[in-house]
């Protein structure tokens, strides 16, 4: 058999069979399940005078490990004295030791109930700036609880001072009070609130709800793509209303610029989505020297079913710039598919996020519909990358086996883009 | 809507200290991390210093530490970089920003101020 840490159970009796007057007691300490053999067996009686004696191992016929019962033998002030079991096991490991600390007897006891309560939204349904977390511990027989509050099951620095505790009738209640921030709150972790009492752990989690549908009306509007700024230098913003309820009222989208100048002539969509529910999109131009030069623009939605107007705007992002790094390759030929390749693109630390991926073959940019591109996502400090795939035929790449993958970015140079070719058969 | 003003850059011998202010708005100041970045010019984008929600825990770039000095005023929605012993490496373009995630070190920041520049020069 391999090598087992035991396990170690106080042995108690229950406090209402022993005789008040009685001047000694026994108590003991099972160590089970382990092996090899030996187990070392020592007590921590503190200001009291104890003998000890412990039992020959026995072997558990089904594992064919040990276990083996040390008896503690106090006399004196015993009732108020918590006692210490040490259990080592060297075999295990030179420190290996699990220490039970117990009281002589165990009284019948009414265990508690712990239940979570969390504060409420705001007036608006919005989750104020903190969360109060209260963790109610409640009819237990009175005797000293510990309360532990954890954050994904890590134990969280709390000021535990502020717990109060009542005692109606025979029972007591004891609440403590958590506070978190909104951040934290939201950032889906679990919270618990753990009590420990007669040796025993009861607990009660909670976090964020998900959100529940229907939701409401939503507005966003989005900057212009990089393509369109640099490339094709007639950028567009679009806003773009979501989840609207078919009905008689008009959606009103209006345009409007931080400086007060006029804004140009924007287009208008509606779509019905197969929820039935309504989507607009409006869509202006702006001018390219004018959004360069950090103009805001804003989108305001109102319609009669809305209690207040949705204000939505959009400028440069600011913050600091990083050009793309474009790295592009071919994929080998794959088993059972000779007259497709898969081409792609890994374009990495620019910042900020926005930029356009196009690729291009005899000197013609493909159809964005040819290539997958995914959307920008952050790295740790050294801003975002997106991956860009395209599939070739074989008809593609015998006509000329050059594939060119460029990103468009505000700050690459010159004029704003970056390439890399590629091809499908290098050095043929 | 998320808003960052910085303010304090300008221009100051090497060995001088200088104190940048951000002046925070449109979210909830006391529930976010907040970061300082630079970026000196020609150079990639640099993270300066983080500090966490309360202000207990802060983290220093290694060619910062010791020298700067990152707080907050929750009640006022103010975040401060105290900068001391400067050297000429230390020009830059200075940002404070601030992410939905938690975002203590170097990280990709989704809300940038417009920055405040430093220049240090004899």
């Known amino acids: 058999a391999s090598t087992q840490s035991p396990s170690v159970f106080p042995l108690t009796r229950c406090c209402k069979n022993i005789p008040s007057n009685a001047t000694s007691v026994t108590l003991g300490c099972l160590a089970t399940g382990y092996f090899p053999e030996p187990v070392m067996v020592t007590w921590d009686t503190g200001s009291l005078n104890g003998t000890t004696m412990t039992l020959p191992a026995t072997t558990l016929t089904l594992s064919g490990h040990y276990a083996t019962i040390s008896l503690l033998t106090v006399s004196g002030a015993w009732a108020k004295q918590m006692f210490t079991c040490r259990v080592a096991h060297t075999p295990s490991s030179t420190d290996w030791v699990d220490n039970k600390t117990f009281s002589v007897c165990s009284r019948d006891f009414t265990p508690p109930t712990v239940k979570i309560l969390q504060s409420s939204c705001d007036g608006g349904g919005h989750f104020p700036p903190t969360i109060q977390l209260l963790c109610l511990v409640s009819g237990y027989t009175p005797g000293t609880i510990n309360i532990t509050w954890l954050e994904d099951g890590q134990v969280m620095d709390v000021d535990l001072s502020t717990a109060s505790t009542t005692q109606e009738g025979e029972l007591a209640s004891t609440q403590s009070e958590l506070t978190l921030s909104q951040k934290h709150w939201l950032s889906d972790r679990t919270y618990t609130c753990q009590v420990t009492y007669q040796g025993h752990t009861f607990e009660d989690s909670t976090k964020k709800c998900a959100d529940s549908n229907p939701r409401g009306v939503s507005a966003y509007l989005s900057r212009p793509s990089p393509f369109d700024l640099f490339i094709r230098k007639s950028p567009t913003i679009t806003c773009l209303v979501v989840d609207l309820a078919p009905s008689k009222g008009t959606v009103n989208l209006t345009w409007s610029r931080a400086s007060g100048k006029p804004v140009n002539h924007s287009t208008r969509k509606e779509e019905k989505q197969r929820n039935g529910t309504l989507t607009v999109t409006s869509t202006l131009p702006v001018g390219t020297r004018d959004w360069i030069e950090g103009e805001t623009y804003q989108c305001r939605v109102t319609h009669p079913h809305l209690p207040r107007a949705l204000m939505r705007s959009t400028t440069k992002t600011s913050g600091p710039r990083a050009a793309p790094e474009v790295y592009a390759f071919a994929t080998p030929e794959w088993p059972g598919s000779r007259d497709k390749r898969t081409l792609a693109c890994l374009i990495q630390n620019f910042m900020p996020e926005d930029i356009s991926v196009q690729w291009l073959h005899n000197e013609v940019q493909l159809p964005d519909a040819r290539h997958s591109t995914t959307q920008p996502r952050k790295t740790k400090g050294s801003g975002f990358f997106v991956f860009s795939r395209l599939e070739v035929t074989r008809a593609e790449w015998e006509q000329k086996d050059e594939f060119i993958c460029r990103a468009v970015h505000e700050a690459a140079s010159p004029s704003q883009t970056v390439q890399r070719a590629v091809s499908v058969n290098p050095g043929k | 809507e998320v808003q960052l003003v910085e303010s304090g850059g300008g221009l100051v011998q090497p060995g001088g200290p200088l104190r940048l202010s951000c002046a925070a708005s449109?979210?909830?100041?006391?529930?976010?991390?907040m970061s300082w970045v630079r970026q000196a010019p020609g150079k990639g984008p640099e993270w300066v210093s983080s500090i966490d929600t309360g202000g207990d825990i802060t983290h220093y770039a290694d060619s910062v530490k010791g020298r700067f000095t990152i707080s907050r005023d929750n009640a006022n929605n103010m975040l401060y970089l105290q900068m001391n012993s400067l050297k000429p490496e230390d020009t830059a373009v200075y940002w404070c920003?601030?992410?939905?995630?938690?975002?203590?070190?170097?990280?990709?920041?989704?809300?940038y101020g417009q920055g405040t520049q430093v220049t240090v020069s004899s």
């Open positions: 449109g979210f909830t100041f006391g529930s976010y991390d």
């Open positions: 920003a601030t992410d939905e995630d938690y975002a203590l070190g170097p990280n990709e920041y989704d809300y």
